[in-house]
């Protein structure tokens, strides 16, 4: 059964990805920056399910793909720290989170997201299992 | 209403130069960025490239990089296609359009009227 | 060079199912956009991001895309679809766009 330390640790790392996750979406929503709609061009998948943080196994399949559209994206007026480093930080938290000990093939669903809808509901996904654990 | 109008049609001779306009109206040309697109007689499209004019970032097409440069003046909403020295294989169709964003993500959802461009001696 | 491949034609009868392909490496990761030409007209967007339909553009024009392939249908075709149509998308990059080889559609 999980201890109240690892049910905290989970909940910090759960926060620690949200906040990753909600300043890229601040970056890419800021109005100042309506450049970013090239952004748009890029096809994101998204899972069938995600209700469990075995599901993040998702989530990693797409960070390679969010990379290349952070990397398409950086400009005067939108720049987020190293992106390559963001990116391997989520990609470590993800790990942690989701475990190791089984391998889950993502299931996705038929219809694809923009970058936006993709962080969204990545976002939802985080505050949703971080209530449960609160 | 939002709209782009394009200069009008142009007969030059081979090695002129030439300067075509397209001005934006009816909404933040800043914030909007505009592509070019050529189309011969008789063809397809091609994307030449495209240009951001709130701080004049552009791309070309490898296709058209070192044969024309797109730019544009945002205090006169107007955005620009220009040839050092035209070719008889530049005679065509030349359209401005402008890539959306909100309801039409990346797509072009405005065009110009076109602007040919005729090069013969 | 990247590039878009279509079928240069396709036919159909009024009211019948006309499908028109694009094919491109990049698509799996890569919207497309399509637009239908008139003749003696500027393009109009019909389709944006693969399946979304702008206002104004008729229920009878669907997108849809799978793996290496973008497919645009017209349901029930009519005799003022017949046009070019193009698809559009970008590289791997997102940095180049590129307009597919163009179909014409002949509405018989």
């Known amino acids: 059964a999980p201890t109240s330390s690892s049910t905290k640790k989970t909940q910090l790392q759960l926060e620690h990805l949200l906040l990753d996750l909600q300043m890229i979406l601040n970056g890419i929503n800021n109005y100042k920056n309506p450049k970013l709609t090239r952004m748009l061009t890029f096809k994101f998948y998204m899972p069938k399910k995600a209700t469990e943080l075995r599901h993040l196994q998702c989530l990693e399949e797409e960070l390679k793909p969010l990379e290349e559209v952070l990397n398409l994206a950086q400009s005067k007026s939108f720049h987020l720290r190293d992106t390559k480093d963001l990116i391997s930080n989520i990609n470590v938290i993800v790990l942690e989170l989701k475990g190791s000990e089984t391998t889950l093939m993502c299931e996705y669903a038929d219809e694809t997201a923009t970058i936006v809808e993709f962080l969204n509901r990545w976002i939802t996904f985080c505050q949703s299992i971080i209530s449960t654990l609160t | 209403e939002v709209q782009l109008v394009q200069s009008g049609a142009e007969v030059k001779k081979p090695g002129e130069s030439l300067k075509i306009s397209c001005k934006g109206s009816?909404?933040?040309?800043?914030?909007?960025?505009i592509g070019w697109v050529r189309q011969m007689s008789g063809k397809g499209l091609e994307w030449m490239g495209i240009?951001?004019?709130?701080?004049?970032?552009?791309r070309y097409s490898p296709s058209f990089q070192g044969q024309v440069t797109i730019s544009a003046d945002k205090s006169i909403s107007t955005a620009y296609l220009q040839w050092s020295s035209l070719k008889a294989s530049d005679t065509a169709m030349y359209y401005c359009?402008?890539?959306?964003?909100?309801?039409?993500?990346?797509?072009?959802?405005?065009w110009g009227q076109g602007t040919t461009v005729t090069v013969s001696s | 060079s990247y590039e878009l491949t279509q079928p240069p034609s396709v036919s159909v009868s009024p009211g019948q199912t006309a499908r028109i392909t694009c094919s491109g490496d990049?698509?799996?990761?890569?919207?497309a956009y399509w637009y239908q030409q008139k003749s003696g007209q500027a393009p109009v967007l019909v389709i944006y991001?693969?399946?979304k339909r702008p206002s104004g553009i008729p229920e009878r024009f669907s997108g849809s895309s799978s793996g290496t392939m973008a497919t645009l249908t017209i349901s029930g075709a009519q005799v003022e679809d017949e046009a070019d149509y193009y698809c559009?998308?970008?590289?791997?990059?997102?940095?180049?766009?590129?307009f597919g080889t163009g179909t014409k559609v002949t509405v018989l």
């Open positions: 559009y998308s970008t590289d791997s990059s997102g940095n180049h766009y590129v």
């Open positions: 359009a402008r890539h959306g964003g909100g309801w039409s993500g990346w797509g072009m959802d405005v």
């Open positions: 990049a698509l799996p990761r890569k919207y």
């Open positions: 009816g909404y933040n040309f800043t914030n909007y960025w």
């Open positions: 240009i951001y004019p709130g701080d004049s970032e552009t």
């Open positions: 991001e693969d399946s």
